[in-house]
């Protein structure tokens, strides 16, 4: 059975989820990346994507979601601002990288948002103030940004081994210091 690891974030309404998903720098720096939610019994829902090709350190905002791809560090930074209770759920970072074989990583983000004022932010970077100002360089982006005809595809974790498939996604690992909750299926 495939072992999936969940990394749990417990935050309050109004706070900001701040996730850093790492990837293999040489392979995927310019690949389009996406942020998805996986609701119980449903297919993954793509919520936001970087541009294609992904631009370095160029914030893309879709609603309350901000994606920034740091090519130099091999990091996709995902922020969800002004969190609401209904944002609670299981999320994952993915890379659109056809037609190469997937490099499988299995960490997903379990977000739990509870009611209550977030208070004064402390040293935890996830505890951000209620009001969040989007940087002026942020662009509004359709997701995904495809050229025509559309050919970009992905694939979720299938096994711990590398699996050769013509069209695939790469699930990225979140590398912030948080609780790991192993989940087995």
């Amino acid at each position: 059975a495939t072992k999936l690891t969940e990394e749990k974030y417990e935050l309050k309404e109004g706070q900001t989820l701040d996730v850093k998903c790492d990837y293999t720098l040489e392979k995927f720096a310019s690949s389009q990346k996406a942020w998805q939610i996986i609701r119980d019994g449903e297919m993954p829902k793509t919520l936001a994507c970087t541009e294609r090709p992904s631009k370095n350190s160029h914030p893309v905002q879709v609603g309350r979601i901000i994606l920034e791809d740091y090519h130099d560090h091999g990091l996709l930074r995902v922020r969800m601002v002004n969190l609401q209770v209904e944002d609670s759920g299981l999320y994952q970072c993915v890379i659109y990288q056809p037609p190469k074989e997937p490099h499988m990583l299995f960490d997903r983000i379990r977000l739990v948002v509870t009611k209550g004022f977030s208070g004064t932010p402390g040293s935890n970077e996830n505890s951000t103030q209620n009001v969040y100002k989007i940087p002026p360089t942020t662009t509004k982006a359709l997701c995904p940004l495809y050229t025509s005809p559309r050919t970009v595809t992905q694939a979720p974790p299938k096994s711990t081994a590398d699996v050769s498939t013509p069209d695939s996604e790469i699930n990225l690992t979140n590398v912030t210091d948080i609780i790991r909750v192993p989940v087995f299926n």
């Epitope: 019994g41 297919m43 793509t46 609603g63 069209d167």
Partner: antibody, heavy 119, light 113 residues
Framework: QLQLQESGPGLVKPSETLSLTCTVS??????????WGWIRQPPGKGLEWIGS???????YYNPSLKSRVTISVDTSKNQFSLKLSSVTAADTAVYYC???????????WGQGTTVTVSS | DIVMTQSPDSLAVSLGERATINCKSS????????????LAWYQQKPGQPPKLLIY???TRESGVPDRFSGSGSGTDFTLTISSLEPEDVAVYYC?????????FGGGTKVEIK
């Protein structure tokens, strides 16, 4: 260019099992950006989603048909299939296979195949 | 299940005139975090499969003429054909893909007056 093509018998007897196959060409079924599904349209009526499957075999069914539906995938043949058991005349419809992707909905469709349930 | 209700059932419009189709969902299909509505519009011509026109309620699919536009949010949506062309004669369906089971509206038949 990705194409989907449905195949299977056009006539099925009541109480039997309807079996259809969708062959994917011009692209790989082995990708979970896409889910592969079945939709049907009774004569002169609207569209009804039957269910969808991922390349890894995760299935999602319409509760109204769940007890009678099985969708399966064969990645080696780049195909996915529909089985609908205990059919009645109400299952007479054009059956479409389609590709689903969450930002888009169902963006590529097969031409459809007509299935008539009759003795 | 989310029930999708379309109106009118049929619509006769003169060539070059505007056609407006409405779609109402029984619950919101707006996803809060990205402010996107998971609603699509399809065009189906006789003897053909449906063709995706609009996704995310207002984004035109690649290759779709700009006379087609989608608007609305939450539970109320509109497909507008700004200037009807002969090839636009078809049945149009809205569909929610926010939650399972995916559901379609009953369709609106657009004809030339």
């Amino acid at each position: 260019q990705l194409q989907l093509q449905e195949s299977g018998p056009g006539l099925v007897k009541p109480s039997e099992t309807l079996s259809l196959t969708c062959t994917v060409s011009g692209g790989s079924i082995s990708s979970s950006s896409y889910y592969w599904g079945w939709i049907r349209q009774p004569p002169g009526k609207g569209l009804e989603w039957i269910g969808s499957i991922s390349y890894s075999g995760s299935t999602y069914y319409n509760p109204s048909l769940k007890s009678r539906v099985t969708i399966s995938v064969d990645t080696s043949k780049n195909q996915f299939s529909l089985k609908l058991s205990s059919v009645t005349a109400a299952d007479t419809a054009v059956y479409y296979c389609a590709r689903y992707y969450s930002p888009y909905g169902m963006d590529v469709w097969g031409q459809g195949t007509t299935v008539t349930v009759s003795s | 299940d989310i029930v999708m209700t379309q109106s009118p059932d049929s619509l006769a419009v003169s060539l070059g005139e505007r056609a407006t189709i409405n779609c109402k969902s029984s619950q919101s299909v707006l996803f809060s975090s990205n402010n996107k509505n998971y609603l699509a519009w399809y065009q189906q011509k006789p003897g053909q499969p449906p063709k995706l026109l609009i996704y995310w309620a207002s984004t035109r699919e690649s290759g779709v003429p700009d006379r087609f536009s989608g608007s609305g949010s939450g539970t109320d949506f509109t497909l507008t054909i700004s200037s009807l062309e002969p090839e636009d004669v078809a049945v149009y369906y809205c569909q929610q893909y926010d939650s399972l089971p995916f559901t379609f509206g009953g369709g609106t038949k657009v004809e030339i007056k």
